[in-house]
Every structure is written in C-alpha cells, then in structure tokens.
Interface confidence: low
C-alpha cells in the first residue's frame, strides 16, 4: 500500500475493470490498476479515478496513508437523471430530502425510519404502505399460532429505537446531519458516510467512518441454535485487532458484530457509536480513523429491495449514533 518496494505487479498484463471504471497507473507509477470510485478507500498505490475528477481525501495531514475517494470541490451530482449543483437541496421523493455536496448526495428521511422490535403489545410488527399515505406505517400482525407468544416474549427486550433529532437551530444555522449510511460492505472493513453542516462555519461537509458489520471469515449460520432462525448479536469472542490496507490497530477491541438469519431477514446495526481507532503501518506511520462500533443489532424483514434506489440506500441506515 506504499511505494517503498520495487515494482511488483500481478502476472497478468492488466486487470479487467468493470464498465465505467478507468484503468490507470497506480500512484507509484508501477502497475496498471482499476481506479477507485467515489466513496471507496484509496491509498498511494490505489488511486482514485482521475477521469471522474476524484482525489484521495486523507482527512488530516497525520493520516496520509488511507483516504476516501472524494470529488473535487463543487462537483455536481447526477441523481435520478437530473443534474444538481453542489450545495443544492432537493426533495427526491415524498420520503427524502437530499443535498448534493461535491459529487455526493446525502439524504435525510422525511418518514420515521425506526426499526421496531417485537414487544408484548406488538409481537409481530410489519411495515406497510397505506393508500394515500407517503410514509409506511407499522402494523401489528396477529400471530398464526397464539401459543408461541408467551414463551417467545421472554426473550424480547424493548430497545431504544430512535436517535437524536438530526435538526436543531444554532446561531443562525439550521444544523442538519444526515444519518450515517449503511456500511459499504456486508462483511469486512467498509465505509459509512454522512453529510453535515454541524461546524463553526455552518458549511456542508462530508464525514466518513470505517465500519465492520461482521467479519468475513465468521461462519455465523453454523452457530444458529436448532429451532432458531437468527443470531442477532453473536457472542463476542476474543479481542481482535482491526486491519486496514496492511495497517493494524494498535489496540485490541472486544467489538460487537451483527449476526445472520436463515429466513430471509436482514440483521443490521441498530444503535452504533463512533470512536477513533489508531492504526500502525509497516513503515512506522500511525494514523487515526473514526470507526463505527455496534451497540445493538436488529433482525427484520425491512430489507432493501434492489429495484428501489431509495429503499436500498436508506432503509439500511444506522440509528442512535452517539457521536
């Protein structure tokens, strides 16, 4: 991930890149690589797509190791076939208020986005679209088999399902912060982003944090108890060190991860917090990155539909972030 070694490229002449992704020389001038795209992790070796006006944003000078591909200031956004100027706000549908910022769109849900967990008065919650209403609402289905309700409820715990109010007024500034986006990877290290103007100049800025919903090597389905269909939060095993492009976290963490379901439900982070993690790299450099830590997960049928851009983008948001 740095240029401190001889040029050693894979044997094949050049990688085949997905449609729309440029084949470029890596940052060390060594090998041809597929350029990183908007929002992806980038390094000295793995450059961002220059043909799309992207650059590797490292955050602070101390972190000149791994960054996030970011559009140059003022880049417009193309969303739903429409071009929006940087800084322009628009309502993408009755459900979302969006803002374009340097080539990236951040949206805030106008509908309640809570994940409702089963409770004694509503053991089988389901979100439905009601005629004439924009926002879906929760309804409580009656259980098919009444006998299971009692014992099943013993395992249910009421969770705090809403985070802080994302809008507040402060010194002539309407502070707006979008929810953190879903982690870019369903397993392994990914990125989660949000847009906020919660700063001294009330200027919109993009924030990003590392995230890991679950490790890729964990075979969680094997651990689901007989008769059960989900592991919501697997037992925390031994403390682990996080890895990021060849750099290793300096501390070990007893992190919580989300489990899996075998019945088509999604198991996603429900309440999270953001903490700084220091990584040490093989060339001795230390970098600090914000990272999502999971407090609780929720297993729910409210999974994103591939056919609905808004659902897939925003139904997987994370709530109750403490940072």
């Amino acid at each position: 991930q740095n240029c401190s070694g001889p040029c050693r490229c894979p044997d094949e002449p050049a990688p085949r890149c997905p449609a729309g992704v440029s084949l470029v020389l890596d940052g060390c001038g060594c090998c041809r690589v597929c350029a990183k795209q908007l929002g992806e992790l980038c390094t000295e070796r793995d450059p961002c797509d220059p043909h799309k006006g992207l650059f590797c944003h490292f955050g602070s000078p101390a972190n000149r190791k791994i960054g996030v591909c970011t559009a140059k200031d003022g880049a417009p956004c193309i969303f739903g076939g429409t071009v929006y100027r940087s800084g322009e706000s628009f309502q993408s549908s009755c459900k979302y208020q969006c803002t374009c910022l340097d080539g990236a769109v951040g949206c805030m849900p106008l509908c309640s986005m809570d994940v409702r967990l089963p409770s004694p008065d509503c053991p089988f919650p389901r979100r439905v679209k009601l005629p004439g209403k924009c926002c879906e609402e929760w309804v409580c289905d009656e259980p098919k088999d009444q006998t299971v309700v009692g014992p099943a409820l013993a395992a249910y715990r009421l969770e705090d399902t809403f985070g802080p109010d994302p809008t507040m007024i402060r010194a002539n500034c309407l502070v707006q912060t979008t929810e953190w986006s879903a982690c870019s990877k369903t397993c392994g290290m990914g990125i989660s982003t949000r847009v906020t103007n919660d700063n001294a100049s009330c200027r919109l800025e993009k924030q990003s944090r590392l995230c890991m919903v679950r490790p890729c090597e964990a075979d969680l389905e094997e651990n689901i108890k007989k008769g059960k269909k989900c592991i919501r939060t697997p037992k925390i095993s031994k403390p682990i060190k996080f890895e990021l492009s060849g750099c290793t976290s300096m501390k070990t963490y007893r992190a919580k991860f989300c489990g899996v379901c075998t019945d088509g439900r999604c198991c996603t982070p429900h309440r999270t917090t953001t903490l700084p993690v220091e990584f040490k790299c093989p060339d001795g450099e230390v970098m600090k990155k914000n990272m999502m830590f999971i407090k609780t997960c929720a297993c729910h049928y409210n999974c994103p539909g591939d056919n609905d851009i808004f659902e897939s983008l925003y139904y997987r948001k994370m709530y109750g972030d403490m940072a």
Partner: antibody
Framework: EVTLKESGPVLVKPTETLTLTCTVS????????VHWIRQPPGKGLEWLGV???????DYNAAFMSRLTISKDTSKSQVVFTMTNMDPVDTATYYC????????WGQGTTVTVSS | ESVVTQPPSVSGAPGQRVTISCRSS?????????ANWVQQLPGTAFKGLIG???NRAPGVPDRFSGSKSGTSASLAITGLQAEDEADYYC?????????FGGGTKLTVLG
C-alpha cells in the same frame, strides 16, 4: 545497481558505544527504508530496528533503550548506534533494504572484548 | 519458546519440490505480517527471495513461491537444484517490529 555497505569498528570494548554506517547506492533513502539485523556466530538472525523512508523508526523492544538509527538522505547514509556494548553483542551486523529485505550489505563483524 | 518457528532442516532430491514452514505462535499469519523469506548461501551474504507473503524479489526465479495458511507462512521451491542448498530464514512483522525464525538448512541430496 543496488548496493549496501556497512562500515565501522571491528573491535569494541565492553560498555562502549558501537557506531556503524550503512552507505547505499542505486536507490534513495527517501524511497526505501533500511533495516539493521545481526547474526551472532553460529546462530540465526536477530532483527534490531529500521528507519523508514519518511524518517520514522521502529526498534526491537529488547534493544530499545540502547539503539538509535538515523539517516542523512543527501549522503545516502544510515547511522546505527548501540550503547553499552557487551560480549554477547559480538556478531556480524547487516543493513538491508526494506521491501522484502531484497538487498543486503555484506555485513561487518563486530567483536566485543576487553 | 520462540514467537516464529521454522524446522531446523529439510531435504530433497534434485527436481523435487520442498516446502519450508514458518509458524507464528501468536495467531494466524495475515497479509499484515508481511511474511519475508531470505536466503543465505554458504559463505556469502543474504539475498531476499519473497516479500509481502508472495511477492518475488527482482531476479528471483519463479521456482520460489510464498504463501500463507492458518498460523503459518510457507516457502515452496520446485525443481530443486544443487545451488538451492542454503539456509533460509523467514521474518514476520508484528505491528511494531519484525521477528526472524530460527532458520532452516536445506540440503539437496545426491
């Protein structure tokens, strides 16, 4: 052609300080780090420390209090200093280029004796 | 007990394939351990063979290859030749420092 060459005293007295210089050619010290490794007679290799291309250093914890590695990039030289030498420090000392330890110096044999 | 262990010796006939293991006693070997392999031919200086688990150093023939699995990194040499007889050392990076294995003497039989 990439070369590394160690130079310094052959004999050091106990409690004295050993200073070795690694002079490199064929590459820049702003592009590659340089490691120091030693091999006692008839034994295996022991990693001592490294100075990275951007000037940061890492040391073997066992020698942390005794070791200093610095460099003069313009002279293409890395300087290795080990204080309070002891007869058990008798060994051949090598410098090697970072990037898979791909190039090594020929080594300089240092004897610690009174 | 050493953190990084290698077998003291391995042997093979010319043309054969041999592997030398490098075991980490403190967990799985990952890409972040940057497994390195160096060769010391009798009476000569050291030469780097493999860096970053599987990247061959310049000029190293493709008979030499590196890999990792579980708690070990491995060096494989195919088509063994008489000139491969040497001492081989692995080195693993642990966040702040490298640790060398004790070395393995490769003998080419016959």
């Amino acid at each position: 052609e990439v070369t590394l060459k160690e130079s310094g005293p052959v004999l050091v007295k106990p409690t004295e300080t050993l200073t070795l210089t690694c002079t490199v050619s064929g590459f820049s010290l702003s592009t590659f780090g340089v490691h120091w490794i030693r091999q006692p007679p008839g034994k295996g290799l022991e990693w001592l420390g490294v100075i990275w291309r951007r000037g940061g250093t890492d040391y073997n914890a066992a020698f942390m209090s005794r070791l200093t590695i610095s460099k003069d990039t313009s002279k293409s030289q890395v300087v290795f200093t080990m204080t309070n030498m002891d007869p058990v420090d008798t060994a051949t000392y090598y410098c090697a280029r970072d990037g898979g330890f791909d190039y090594w110096g020929q080594g300089t044999t240092v004897t610690v004796s009174s | 007990e050493s953190v990084v262990t290698q077998p003291p010796s391995v042997s093979g006939a010319p043309g054969q394939r041999v592997t030398i293991s490098c075991r980490s006693s403190i967990g799985a070997v990952t890409t972040s351990n940057y497994a390195n392999w160096v060769q010391q031919l009798p009476g000569t200086a050291f030469k780097g063979l493999i860096g970053g688990t599987s990247n061959r150093a310049p000029g190293v023939p493709d008979r030499f290859s590196g890999s990792k699995s579980g708690t070990s990194a491995s060096l494989a040499i195919t088509g063994l030749q008489a000139e491969d007889e040497a001492d081989y050392y692995c080195a693993l990076w642990y966040s702040t420092h490298y640790v060398f294995g004790g070395g393995t003497k490769l003998t080419v039989l016959g």
